[in-house]
Interface confidence: medium
Amino acid sequence: MRKTRLWGLLWMLFVSELRAATKLTEEKYELKEGQTLDVKCDYTLEKFASSQKAWQIIRDGEMPKTLACTERPSKNSHPVQVGRIILEDYHDHGLLRVRMVNLQVEDSGLYQCVIYQPPKEPHMLFDRIRLVVTKGFSGTPGSNENSTQNVYKIPPTTTKALCPLYTSPRTVTQAPPKSTADVSTPDSEINLTNVTDIIRVPVFNIVILLAGGFLSKSLVFSVLFAVTLRSFVP
């Protein structure tokens, strides 16, 4: 009984240590149904210009799911549309533009831009975007404030690209590129974003964890490993 409690305690210490070591930033966007999310994901121009890029959603406790991706190799400024998602890769500027038009409440969730680089794992472009879509009128006639560009017209020449099947929750430890977004809608008072609601998101990554390299309290790891090992020894 005491051994089980100790084991549980060590796991808790281990997990909390891991959570502290693998925090990712997340920014929150609050939009209304019918509005458009318009996100810019920056990437290193020289490294990733022609790499295939994707827009993913991360549902609680699940692997990231790819919703749309660019062609392979990625074509410059060539829109790719998958349903209500439009991707455009601007090679000259090192940025991927992602638009989600006519947002629905069920679109709420955590999103990220990634770069596919097989056979390696996808490279995540930080930060993640916490999208909150609420019900409400997004375009009241005669409203007192309007965006000068109210409606996103879906480009006529869009392509649907085939995305790789694999997804990965693995994080990347290098310095994160930034992402920026603009919202353009027919709202009377257009809620741009709650851009500054930055939440620190712990990412539980057992792969990096077992590599063991970046835990500051290596003692916790060692003791936990020893206890775990002992519990398997007859």
Epitope: Q149, K178, D182, L192, T193, V195, I198
Partner: antibody
Framework: QVQLVQSGAEVKRPGSSVKVSCKAS????????ISWVRQAPGQGLEWMGG????????NGAQKFQGRVTITADESTSTAYMELSSLRSEDTAVYYC????????????????WGQGTTVTVSS | AIQLTQSPSSLSASVGDRVTITCRAS??????LAWYQQKPGKAPKLLIY???SLQSGVPSRFSGSGSGTDFTLTISSLQPEDFATYYC?????????FGGGTKVEIK
């Protein structure tokens, strides 16, 4: 670091138009957000609108709708603000400002400003 | 449009004083607020963004706080070069709006 240089002072007649330019150098103009802000003599700051050159996306205050046109020329890294049907109350210093830090939303905080262009509307 | 009300509209202070300027939004704007400093005949200068983040190159005597509807800019120890007009600006929703300004004068 991006620098913004604006066109010179203008004196205009009521009912005419003025076009102010804002040339960027030393940074990523296309993916910056360029705002236009004006300040009447002895008054506060007033946001007129903005543009993201790479996307051509513009947003503006209703107060100026139908009178202001904001454009950008990526090839010369220059943004323009044209204000038509001028009246005496449009006499002000017009500033262009860029948001180059960037973090999701384009008009996050205007961290680079032009020197200002004085527009005087007088008959 | 979201209205920003700054107070006081002007204040007199001495070098070394602690100065506090407040900015109240007509509705919640999360932390989507910036503070600017403007000197006569000059363009505004960004001091604080995201309500409390100090813009690079800005002295640490400047600090911002608040969230929702009430925000504060504090100058911990006023220096001669700090005599200027200060503006708050929200970027939570279009149109972007500025406060009316607070003029900090020498006592």
């Amino acid at each position: 670091q991006v620098q913004l240089v604006q066109s010179g002072a203008e004196v205009k007649r009521p009912g005419s138009s003025v076009k102010v330019s804002c040339k960027a150098s030393g940074g990523t103009f296309s993916s910056s957000a360029i705002s236009w802000v004006r300040q009447a003599p002895g008054q506060g700051l007033e946001w007129m609108g903005g543009i993201i050159p790479i996307f051509g996306t513009t947003n503006g205050a209703q107060k100026f709708q139908g009178r202001v046109t904001i454009t950008a020329d990526e090839s010369t890294s220059t943004a323009y603000m044209e204000l038509s049907s001028l009246r005496s109350e449009d006499t002000a210093v017009y500033y262009c400002a860029a948001m180059v830090r960037g973090n999701y939303f384009y008009f996050y905080g205007m961290d680079v400003w032009g020197q200002g262009t004085t527009v005087t509307v007088s008959s | 449009a979201i209205q920003l009300t700054q107070s006081p509209s002007s204040l007199s202070a001495s070098v070394g004083d602690r100065v506090t300027i407040t900015c109240r939004a007509s509705q919640g704007i999360s932390s989507a607020l910036a503070w600017y400093q403007q000197k006569p005949g000059k363009a505004p200068k960004l001091l604080i963004y995201a309500a409390s983040s100090l813009q690079s190159g800005v002295p640490s005597r400047f600090s911002g706080s608040g969230s929702g509807t009430d925000f504060t800019l504090t100058i911990s120890s006023l220096q001669p070069e700090d005599f200027a007009t200060y503006y708050c600006q929200q970027y939570n929703s279009y149109p972007l709006t500025f406060g009316g300004g607070t003029k900090v004068e020498i006592k």
